[in-house]
Interface confidence: low
């Protein structure tokens, strides 16, 4: 069917369309193009013969109509009065006509729209504004952009005369924003540029910075004030009711208590003509003296003395706080506080309460801190510590020995040798020993201040052959896969060779096995059932050599798994059920028994006489290592046949 | 006549450093406690720092722990204020005063220190 497409459907002014053709039939004698919705030879606009290829303008030729071989038709520059309905009228070969209809529609370019306002500054709460979208243009669709978002939905808001105007009821500060209108019709669309509203507004309630009221005096006072108000507002300043200056700023120097009072800004907008208020009382208090702090006691002695510590000066309605170590007290009932905090009191001294200790006054506005105090607390002397810790010696060595004891003050040492004064130092000192510088060598450390002493003796020996060793265990009764052991070899001598031997053999190379101290101590990481064996330390040097008495390690290992004997699980009726559990353990495992779940006895062996079907179920072993903490189970089913019913059942015990 | 001018102000991206310096006259300064306080824009005083007259115990902010150093020169009559790790929470008048804090004694006129990116 024959068909016209107009290319486009809405044409701006000045540009062309294309009323393109399709299903053009063959064999054709010519075609002629109208405008209008029928064949009017009045409204013709051209004729075209295909014979004579001759193209034939009508009445309604303009002359900016193309007229093509495949009978589409071009109007170039278009104009508003094109809008409407063009029809082709074919006449075919046979002279058989046919027509077709189409139509576009012609809309002008829109020109660059403008806003125009009926009051250029609303007031806040008070006006309206009317903005109205310029020129009015027919056919054409006007649009509103807030901040070039789309309007908001608001009971304030409101578009008339065909969306042309946009009316803002009771402007709010919020309202100041950039307005844009748009036109659009189908060819075009333009933007006008933005109007900002300016809405007049406050001043509101204003705000004094800053918040504080109260002051020292000698400060300077420098108080500020803002009112949100547009325009800006302008400031005034009263004190106790008093007109001081029109500034925003309120400034005075090395305030004294007299300056107290209550201070007053007014804020005005002369274009709104309100104004607000705010008053704020400042106070001015008088310069509180730096606190210190006084002791009862410079030198209290551990364990003995208290001390009680005073915050200074002492001034009424006034908020004392401490702290030690640079924090806040801690909980303590050896720290007591009196009713007013002035005081706080240590019980019972001990050498960390040293401190530093701080006191500090509270008041209106800050706290003022004292310097830190420290605590001279006496203490010790604790028991003196001999080193080294060699208690053998070979004949021709130097004998140095070297004692401390913690104290304060420090200790005053004095050395004694089986009971008999020596020298009042801290280090002893004997060249060239013999056999009878054998005996009991004693430091008493004294501390002068708190008149206490403290002893300790070591027994040196000075022999050319070594004494027999002996092995000390820190674990005499390790627990298998957990713990470890430590053997050490004693006595810790000078030039002595160490050696250990397990079984009779020498140590075997094992990543559990460590030696450390010179060799003198052995460690087995991880202890398992096979290091329960005879362990024997020696020791040596260039003239003699010695072994210990073999140790033997107690490895506290298992219950393992138990295995129930005999294996049978078929019995005869009126046989014997003799069950004896064994498990692997050291020390020996608890045994318990349970058939079906129910608790039985505490035996080893579990014996139950003429057995019978009743007795069919599950037979459970129990072991548990007190020492290890270790438990273990098995379950054997046993199933009583009837006499005679199945060949091959056990006769039983 | 009690003069502290404070110094080392300025203008520093987060993270960055500062060190305020204090040069103070007309008292006594090896032997009053010195502490630093700030007023951040449209606050109050904050307490900042304390340090006593020999300088061998010194306080701090929790805002400002581990970040801060207050030290004295007693020989110079300057008090030093060494800002690492600065934040934007930072930005103040910063000013060193006599005595344990706000208000306590004379303050100078400050240094303005501004964190911002």
């Known amino acids: 069917k024959l068909t016209i497409e107009s290319t486009p459907f809405n044409v701006a002014e000045g540009k062309e369309v294309l009323l393109l053709v399709h299903n053009l039939p063959q064999h054709l004698f010519g075609y002629s193009w109208y405008k209008g919705e029928r064949v009017d030879g009045n409204r013709q606009i051209i004729g075209y013969v295909i014979g004579t290829q001759q193209a034939t303008p009508g009445p309604a030729y303009s002359g900016r109509e193309i007229i093509y071989p495949n009978a589409s038709l071009l109007i170039q520059n278009i104009i508003q009065n094109d809008t409407g309905f063009y029809t082709l009228h074919v006449i075919k070969s046979d002279l058989v006509n046919e027509e077709a209809t189409g139509q576009f529609r012609v809309y002008p370019e829109l020109p660059k729209p403008s806003i125009s306002s009926n009051n250029s500054k609303p007031v806040e709460d008070k006006d309206a504004v009317a903005f109205t979208c310029e020129p009015e243009t027919q056919d054409a669709t006007y649009l509103w952009w807030v901040n070039n978002q789309s309007l908001p939905v608001s009971p304030r808001l409101q578009l008339s005369n065909g969306n042309r105007t946009l009316t803002l009821f009771n402007v709010t500060r919020n309202d100041t924003a950039s307005y844009k209108c748009e036109t659009q019709n189908p060819v075009s669309a333009r933007r006008s540029d933005s109007v900002i509203l300016n809405v007049l507004y406050g001043p509101d309630a204003p705000t004094i910075s800053p918040l504080n009221t109260s002051y020292r005096s000698g400060e300077n006072l420098n108080l500020s004030c803002h009112a949100a108000s547009n325009p800006p507002a302008q400031y005034s300043w009263f004190v106790n009711g008093t007109f001081q200056q029109s500034t925003q700023e309120l400034f005075i120097p090395n305030i004294t208590v007299n300056n107290s009072g209550s201070y007053t800004c007014q804020a005005h907008n002369s274009d709104t003509g309100l104004n607000r208020t705010t008053v704020t009382t400042i106070t001015v208090y008088a310069e509180p003296p730096k606190p210190f702090i006084t002791s009862n006691n410079s030198n209290p002695v551990e364990d003995e003395d208290a001390v009680a510590l005073t915050c200074e000066p002492e001034i009424q309605n006034t908020t004392y706080l401490w702290w030690v170590n640079n924090q806040s007290l801690p909980v303590s009932p050896r720290l007591q506080l009196s009713n007013d905090n002035r005081t706080l009191t240590l019980l019972s001294v001990t050498r960390n309460d040293v401190g530093p200790y701080e006191c500090g006054i509270q008041n209106e506005l800050s706290v003022d801190h004292s310097d830190p105090v420290i605590l001279n607390v006496l203490y010790g002397p604790d028991d003196p510590t001999i080193s080294p810790s060699y208690t053998y010696y070979r004949p021709g060595v130097n004998l140095s020995l070297s004692c401390h004891a913690a104290s304060n003050p420090p200790a005053q040492y004095s050395w004694l040798i089986d009971g008999n004064i020596q020298q009042h130092t801290q280090e002893l000192f004997i060249s060239n020993i013999t056999e009878k510088n054998s005996g009991l060598y004693t430091c008493q450390a004294n501390n002068s201040a708190s008149g206490h002493s403290r002893t300790t003796v070591k027994t040196i020996t000075v022999s050319a052959e070594l004494p027999k060793p002996s092995i000390s265990s820190n674990n005499s009764k390790p627990v298998e896969d957990k713990d470890a052991v430590a053997f050490t070899c004693e006595p810790e001598a000078q030039n002595t060779t160490y050696l250990w031997w397990v079984n009779g053999q020498s140590l075997p190379v094992s990543p559990r096995l460590q030696l450390s101290n010179g060799n003198r101590t052995l460690t087995l990481f991880n202890v398992t059932r096979n290091d329960a064996r005879a362990y024997v330390c020696g020791i040596q040097n260039s003239v003699s050599a010695n072994r210990s008495d073999p140790v033997t390690l107690d490895v506290l290992y298992g219950p393992d798994t138990p295995i129930i004997s005999p294996p049978d699980s078929s019995y005869l009726s009126g046989a014997n059920l003799n069950l004896s559990c064994h498990s692997a353990s050291n020390p020996s495992p608890q045994y318990s028994w349970r058939i079906n779940g129910i608790p039985q006895q505490h035996t080893q062996v579990l014996f139950i006489a003429k057995i019978t079907p009743n007795n069919n179920g599950t037979y459970a072993c129990f072991v548990s290592n007190l020492a290890t903490g270790r438990n273990n189970s098995i379950v054997k089913s046993i199933t009583v046949s009837a006499s005679g019913t199945s060949p091959g059942l056990s006769a039983g015990a | 006549q009690v003069q502290l001018v404070e110094s080392g102000g300025g203008l520093v991206q987060p993270g960055g450093s500062l060190r305020l310096s204090c040069a103070a006259s007309g008292f006594t300064f090896s032997s009053s406690y010195m502490s630093w306080v700030r007023q951040a824009p449209g606050k109050g005083l904050e307490w900042v720092s304390g340090i006593n007259t020999d300088g061998s115990f010194t306080r701090y902010a929790d805002s400002v722990k581990g970040r801060f150093t207050i030290s004295r020169d007693n020989a110079k009559n300057t008090l030093y204020l060494q800002m690492n790790s600065l934040k934007s929470e930072d930005t103040a008048l910063y000013y060193c005063?006599?005595?344990?804090?706000?208000?306590?004694?004379?303050r100078g006129q400050g240094t303005l220190v501004t964190v911002s990116s």
């Open positions: 005063a006599v005595g344990g804090g706000l208000g306590y004694g004379p």
